[in-house]
């Protein structure tokens, strides 16, 4: 299953970064899980996982540094609280749970670049 | 002649990017130029350039928003005062101008991204 | 270390039923699917179920649909085989097996096997 | 189902020999398959996933590569160690099925 992602995202000043996870579906899934991975020195961690219902919102837990949106086989997802040191790849994957057959996809990878902002001076 | 150049840069929050251009020097020059280009929307603009003796110092204008260090065949360049705007392909362009024969070599370009910082909160 | 046992298998005859079991240690149990693997004797490796993580999605091979159920109990990190109806056919060697986190179809620890005769 | 089939189904060969084994798909898995070593009376050992990543602590002799039905998988100089049966797997949707297997021996 093709699953499409931007190459490359900046994060906002604010440590906001938000990319459209794209999936053409060999199938009617009525519930699909994505999962962000990030990978760093060849390292895979998991970032956050959500299923969703099709129709229905995409929930990640509450303390999930994730959010998202999805319409159709698009899933718009942010990326919030990111630091200089969270730079790397974010894959997103893709996964048709039900009904089955079950499929697999995986993107290449958003490069997300984060700049530490500038202290602001104090105020006397 | 080769020229290397990294892929990627970021500048800093304050809007200031560094990146070292290297060139394969075929022969023994004494005289270099150094121009750095941007590529946006297939057009390609210079930004500033330089010329230089083999162990001096390199020397941009003064109105110039890059600066530099060479050190053999390699060039230091910082382009200072980007913006979000300024986010574009910058590509270094090395000349060997004297003795004769006439080099020319132009690197594949450094993506540099630039994000504006969040202005500061007023001070009262 | 990261280690799966099997056990539970046994000579059985056909009709029967047999439930296997895997113990899993030396990693969080409860953030892998898991994998029923079997080979019969001097034949290839074939995929048998899956269990995600949290048990929330199972899937079988068509082989063993309606007659086999997985199950893991995360609290005890042990993984179950449920085989009901058994027939001949199903003589093999079970490995239980632990799915990947980023594929979780492929199976980076095995464990050594358990095995299962079904024959009257 | 897909089907996966793999050839040669047997091969004999000497240490420091390169060795290829192919592996197909009866339909498009994209990269979304994996290799298996085998050795007799023992469990399985992962080798590569998603086509051509080797698991950590697989020798660099082996590699991997294709995409979407063809896939291949080389030991680039087949050491004592390397004789076993090889089973590649796809992981792109239920049922998992493997390959029959490729078994390497000594010439």
């Known amino acids: 299953m093709h699953v499409a992602q931007p190459a490359v995202v900046l994060a906002s000043s604010r440590g906001i970064a938000s990319f459209v996870c794209e999936y053409a579906s060999p199938g009617k899934a009525t519930e699909v899980r994505v999962t962000v991975l990030r990978q760093a020195d060849s390292q895979v961690t998991e970032v956050c996982a959500a299923t969703y219902m099709m129709g229905n919102e995409l929930t990640f837990l509450d303390d999930s540094i994730c959010t998202g949106t999805s319409s159709g086989n698009q899933v718009n997802l942010t990326i919030q609280g990111l630091r200089a040191m969270d730079t790397g790849l974010y894959i997103c994957k893709v996964e048709l749970m039900y009904p089955p057959p079950y499929y697999l996809g995986i993107g290449n990878g958003t490069q997300i670049y984060v700049i530490d902002p500038e202290p602001c001076p104090d105020s006397d | 002649m080769h020229v290397a150049q990294p892929a990627v840069v970021l500048a800093s929050s304050r809007g200031i990017a560094s990146f070292v251009c290297e060139y394969a020097s075929p022969g023994k020059a004494t005289e270099v130029r150094v121009t750095v280009l941007r590529q946006a929307d297939s057009q390609v603009t210079e930004v500033c350039a330089a010329t230089y003796m083999m162990g001096n110092e390199l020397t941009f204008l003064d109105d110039s928003i890059c600066t530099g260090t060479s050190s053999g065949n390699q060039v230091n360049l910082t382009i200072q005062g980007l913006r979000a705007m300024d986010t574009g392909l910058y590509i270094c362009k090395v000349e060997l101008m004297y003795p004769p024969p006439y080099y020319l070599g132009i690197g594949n370009g450094t993506q540099i991204y630039v994000i504006d910082p969040e202005p500061c909160p007023d001070s009262d | 270390q990261v280690q799966l046992v099997e056990s539970g298998g046994g000579v059985v005859q056909p009709g029967r039923s047999l439930r296997l079991s895997c113990a899993a240690s030396g990693f969080t149990f409860s953030s892998y699917g898991m994998h029923w693997v079997r080979q019969a004797p001097g034949k290839g490796l074939e995929w048998v179920a899956v269990?995600?993580?949290?048990?929330?999605?199972?899937y079988y091979a068509d082989s063993v649909k309606g007659r086999f159920t997985i199950s893991r109990d995360n609290s005890k990190n042990t993984l179950y085989l449920q085989m009901n109806s058994l027939r001949a056919e199903d003589t093999a060697v079970y490995y239980c097996?632990?799915?990947?986190?980023?594929?979780?179809?492929?199976?980076?620890?095995w464990g050594q096997g358990t095995t299962v005769t079904v024959s009257s | 189902d897909i089907q996966m089939t793999q050839s040669p189904s047997s091969l004999s060969a000497s240490v420091g020999d390169r060795v290829t084994i192919t592996c197909r798909a009866s339909?498009?898995?994209?990269?979304?398959l994996n290799w298996y070593q085998q050795k007799p009376g023992k469990a399985p050992k992962f080798l590569i996933y998603?086509?051509?990543i080797l698991q950590s602590g697989v020798p660099s002799g082996f590699s991997a590569s294709g995409s979407g039905p063809d896939f291949t998988l080389t030991i680039s100089s087949l050491q004592p160690e390397d004789f076993a049966t090889y089973y590649c797997q796809q992981s792109y949707s239920t049922p998992f099925t493997f390959g029959p297997g490729t078994k390497v021996d000594i010439k």
């Open positions: 269990i995600w993580y949290d048990g929330s999605h199972k």
């Open positions: 998603v086509a051509s």
């Open positions: 097996a632990r799915g990947a986190v980023v594929v979780p179809a492929a199976m980076d620890v």
């Open positions: 339909q498009n898995i994209s990269r979304y």
